[in-house]
Interface confidence: low
């Protein structure tokens, strides 16, 4: 190989050992029969050399550094050449470095021809191995602007006071052009400006200077985004850290087209703007840091550009001004992430603050819109608390548990509407009365409606789930001892059509000691399946529940248990079941931890089933499933 560097070229070539490999055989640079491991060639020198091995690319790397001095004379602006030409260089991993020094008052602009650049984060690499590392200067300090691959959106980077650009090419890469040019600009009065051009839908991830280390103190960095007017851009922060500021405040500023309040100032922890049409700028401003404990400012963010969706021009008013203690969240439904570009799906407040989820609270009217290709990617979850603090005021008071029509009119599917019903301890209890009698969801008779009510205790220490109930059954009412949550959960978009079937009234009633009482009025010829609360985990210790089962005058009820033994093993206390005829008060008592469960029994009058648990040993829980079937009394039961 022969490398000759012209005089005054300000080029230095360095061939040195790369990352040590585990190759057994060493390799040397051979010059005049001398074996060396490092070779430096300066301007005006001509050197002939060879290597002592067949694959020098496994051992050596080459760095070609060109110093460009814009301080003492005119600057060589324009397209930057690869000198010496790659065809004259040995096939080693090579890094071309251009080090441009300029006055503070001079702006320097790197312009990248197509393909533009894509910034990568720490630890990431470029698929083709070609990387661009760009750094600037603040006085004597080097500042890393970033590392970039090809095929991105970054078209120009403006800096002042100097720039160092390193282009790394793997030994096998055929590239023979630098792919960028340098132009002079007036002072930019900040650390740098990065221009990112979108020609269609896509996304770009960008980082503050020095990322993941700290952004230089009290500096300003700007990103300019060029976005076709027919597309919309949204910004989301992937990761950020704030430093400890002594003076000023760290912030981001946006210049947004059409905004009357430019610049719009946001804290880094704020939701960032979305649904922006056309070009916009984003600037990161640091602060004066605490000398003792500076901390670090750093930011990694994503800009997502996509077509405005049909829904993005529609404004929906969600009027929660008459509601109390209620919050509505619109959020992405969990899905498996696909590898290809997926347009963002955002919900926007006042058409400007867009994010992947949004929570609206009661007491106000909210205007929302959507920036989303497919609204089925979102769903709504609502929580409302109805509480009674004064038992004298609340007793016998009733509330309708209905989903407000404003919410049903939104173009997003309702997932859960949860009512938290709170009562004063040991003073009041609750009764739930459905508009349509309810069926308890069981494996034997599952609900197939578009929605169900999930009823559970709302006492933090109590793990008690009463069950899932849907319209179209025999449960007339459910009485519960204390705080519960009732969640209307939808299972199909057809809930919109079936919404009229929802309707549950809750009333505050005098306190009673049992955990729950189910009032069941079976319909003739239908089999009613009932099961104890907490089916999968077992009825909680020392808990008692009852079923009040009505039997019409001309009918007889068959009560059937679905296993021979309850399976419960008591650690302390006894588990028992009482079946009591309501008319005669005659009762049968069964010890659930000892006796076999009763065989099918026939009841001519309304009766109670009461089940009370002991403190069971772990793993031996109390779970019972039983059914009630009505048949006309005229049938011969023998």
């Amino acid at each position: 190989f022969e490398i000759a560097l012209p005089r005054e070229s300000n080029i230095t070539v360095l061939i040195k050992l790369g990352t040590p490999t585990l190759l057994a055989k060493p390799c040397y640079i051979v010059i005049s029969k001398r074996h060396i491991t490092m070779l430096s060639i300066k301007s005006g020198e001509r050197i002939v050399f060879t290597f002592s091995c067949q694959s020098p690319e496994n051992h050596f790397v080459i760095e070609i550094q060109k110093n460009i001095d814009c301080m003492s004379g005119p600057c060589p602006f324009g397209e930057v050449q690869l000198q010496p030409s790659t065809s004259l260089l040995p096939t080693l991993n090579r890094t071309f470095i251009w080090d441009v020094k300029a006055h503070k008052s001079i702006g320097l602009e790197l312009q990248f021809s197509i393909p533009r650049l894509r910034q990568i984060g720490p630890g990431e690499s470029c698929p083709d191995g070609v990387t661009h590392s760009i750094s600037g200067r603040i006085d004597a300090t080097v500042v890393r602007i970033g590392t970039f691959c090809s095929n991105g959106t970054v078209s120009r980077i403006k800096m002042q006071e100097g720039v160092k650009m390193a282009l790394h090419l793997p030994w096998f890469h055929p590239r023979n052009v630098s792919g960028f040019s340098i132009a002079n600009r007036s002072s930019i009065k900040r650390l740098c400006i990065i221009e990112s051009v979108f020609e269609g839908e896509g996304s770009a991830t960008l980082m503050s200077a020095n990322y993941p280390e700290g952004f230089p103190e009290d500096e300003l960095m700007t990103w300019q985004f060029v976005v076709p007017a027919h597309l919309r851009a949204s910004v989301s922060f992937l990761n950020f850290n704030l430093s400890n500021c002594e003076r000023k405040e760290e912030r981001v500023e946006y210049y947004i087209p059409g905004s009357t309040t430019n610049p719009e100032v946001f804290k880094l922890e704020d939701k960032q703007p979305g649904n922006m049409a056309g070009n916009f700028n984003l600037s990161l401003q640091g602060c004066d840091q605490d000398a003792q404990s500076p901390g670090i400012l750093r930011l990694q963010f994503q800009v997502l550009v996509q077509h405005p969706q049909n829904e993005s021009n529609k404004i929906y008013v969600v009027d929660l001004s008459n509601e109390r203690a209620m919050s509505l969240t619109i959020e992405p439904r969990p899905v498996k992430q696909s590898r290809k570009f997926v347009p963002g799906c955002f919900v926007c407040l006042e058409s400007r603050t867009c994010s992947s989820n949004l929570t609206l609270t009661s007491g106000s009217k909210h205007k929302i819109s959507f920036l989303c290709d497919d609204l089925t990617r979102l769903w709504m979850n609502v929580e409302k608390t109805i509480s009674c603090t004064d038992h004298r005021y609340c007793q016998r008071k009733s509330y309708s548990l209905q989903v407000p029509s404003d919410i049903l009119h939104l173009p997003v599917e309702l997932h859960d509407f949860s009512w938290k019903l709170l009562v004063p301890k040991d003073r009041l209890s609750l009764v739930l009365v459905p508009a349509q009698k309810l069926q308890q969801h069981t494996h034997e008779k599952p609900c197939n409606t578009s929605f169900s009510y999930l009823v559970a205790s709302a006492i933090p220490s109590q793990d008690l789930y009463f069950g899932s109930f849907c319209p179209g059954g025999s449960i007339k009412q459910i009485q519960v001892k204390q705080n519960i949550s009732v969640t209307l959960r939808t299972f199909a978009p057809s809930f919109q059509q079936e919404a009229s079937r929802q309707g549950l009234t809750v009333s505050f009633i005098p306190y009673f000691k049992e955990e729950g009482v189910f009032t069941v009025t079976p319909d003739t010829k239908s089999k009613v399946y009932l099961r104890t609360p907490n089916w999968d985990r077992g009825l909680p210790s020392l808990t008692s529940v009852s079923w009040n089962i009505s039997v019409p005058r001309d009918q007889v009820a068959c009560l059937t248990f679905f296993k021979e033994r309850s399976g419960v093993v008591c650690q302390t206390g006894r588990a028992f079941m009482i079946i009591q005829e309501q008319r005669t008060r005659a009762e049968e008592i069964f010890s659930l931890d000892e006796d076999v469960l009763p065989k099918p029994s026939f009841h001519h009058h309304s009766f109670w089933v009461n089940i009370s648990n002991c403190s069971p040993t772990s793993g031996k829980q109390l779970d019972l499933l039983f059914s009630v079937t009505l048949t006309p009394r005229t049938v011969d039961l023998t």
């Epitope: 984060g121 720490p122 630890g123 990431e124 993941p212 280390e213 992937l238 990761n239 990694q300 992405p332 439904r333 969990p334 899905v335 498996k336 992430q337 992947s356 989820n357």
Partner: antibody
Framework: QVQLVQSGSELKKPGESVKVSCKAS????????MHWVRQAPGQGLEWMGW????????TYADDFKGRFVLSLDTSVSTAYLQISSLKSEDTAVYYC????????????WGQGTLVTVSS | EIVLTQSPATLSLSPGERATLSCRAS??????LHWYQQKPGQSPRLLIK???QSISGIPARFSGSGSGSDFTLTISSVEPEDFAVYYC?????????FGQGTKLEIK
């Protein structure tokens, strides 16, 4: 107090699938990322991947792409790890752990779920 | 990916002695390094975050130092309950990696 409670041990045959759950309580699931770490018997810790609990987007380490799926059900504050086409070398304790941002430290861990794959 | 190498693999000390555990990264990771303790049959426990920041509830005898590629976990005076395996973890970039662990055992 913050707790991550994982589902119980599983004994599976090669080729079967398993789904491990991790229920979060004592904090809001969507405020923190959820990470999964594997520890084969007598071995060290291996980071498998994480799931962004706000968006549901998973990220996997290279060795865990393909047969491993991370998912969430925010309504029950639960994260899931599903492994399909189980192999004997999948025998390990799988931990879920709570992380912060994109440079996490794992401040709370589940108790671990032992998955044994044996014919 | 970042490779973390812990040394020594095993450290045998008596209670009251000073323990110094080392973790070296294959490239500079700034201060994106955390330390964990794991006792047999238990989940790991976070001891130190970001190379040197202490964690509330962790005894003051545990401290961390280092930046770039060389890191140290120090236990100023080892207590009987400190005998366990210690792991360092890089949180610099995906994939996050753990060191192979250092076992601190009773001499």
């Amino acid at each position: 107090q913050v707790q991550l409670v994982q589902s119980g041990s599983e004994l599976k045959k090669p080729g079967e699938s398993v789904k491990v759950s991790c229920k979060a309580s004592g904090y809001t699931l969507t405020d923190f990322s959820m990470h999964w770490v594997r520890q084969a018997p007598g071995q060290g810790l291996e980071w498998m991947g994480w799931i962004n609990t706000e968006t549901g987007a998973p990220t996997y380490a290279d060795d865990f792409k393909g047969r491993f799926v991370l998912s969430l059900d925010t309504s029950v504050s639960t994260a899931y790890l599903q492994i399909s086409s189980l192999k004997s070398e999948d025998t390990a304790v799988y931990y879920c752990s709570r992380g912060r941002d994109y440079d996490p430290h794992f401040d709370y861990w589940g108790q671990g779920t032992l998955v044994t794959v044996s014919s | 990916e970042i490779v973390l190498t812990q040394s020594p693999a095993t450290l045998s000390l008596s209670p009251g002695e000073r323990a110094t555990l080392s973790c070296r990264a294959s490239q500079s990771i700034s201060d994106f390094l955390h330390w964990y303790q794991q006792k047999p049959g238990q989940s790991p426990r976070l001891l130190i975050k970001y190379a040197s920041q202490s964690i509330s509830g962790i005894p003051a005898r545990f401290s961390g130092s280092g930046s770039g590629s060389d890191f140290t976990l120090t236990i100023s005076s080892v207590e009987p309950e400190d005998f366990a395996v210690y792991y360092c973890q890089s949180a610099h970039s995906f994939p996050y990696t753990f060191g192979q662990g250092t076992k601190l055992e009773i001499k």
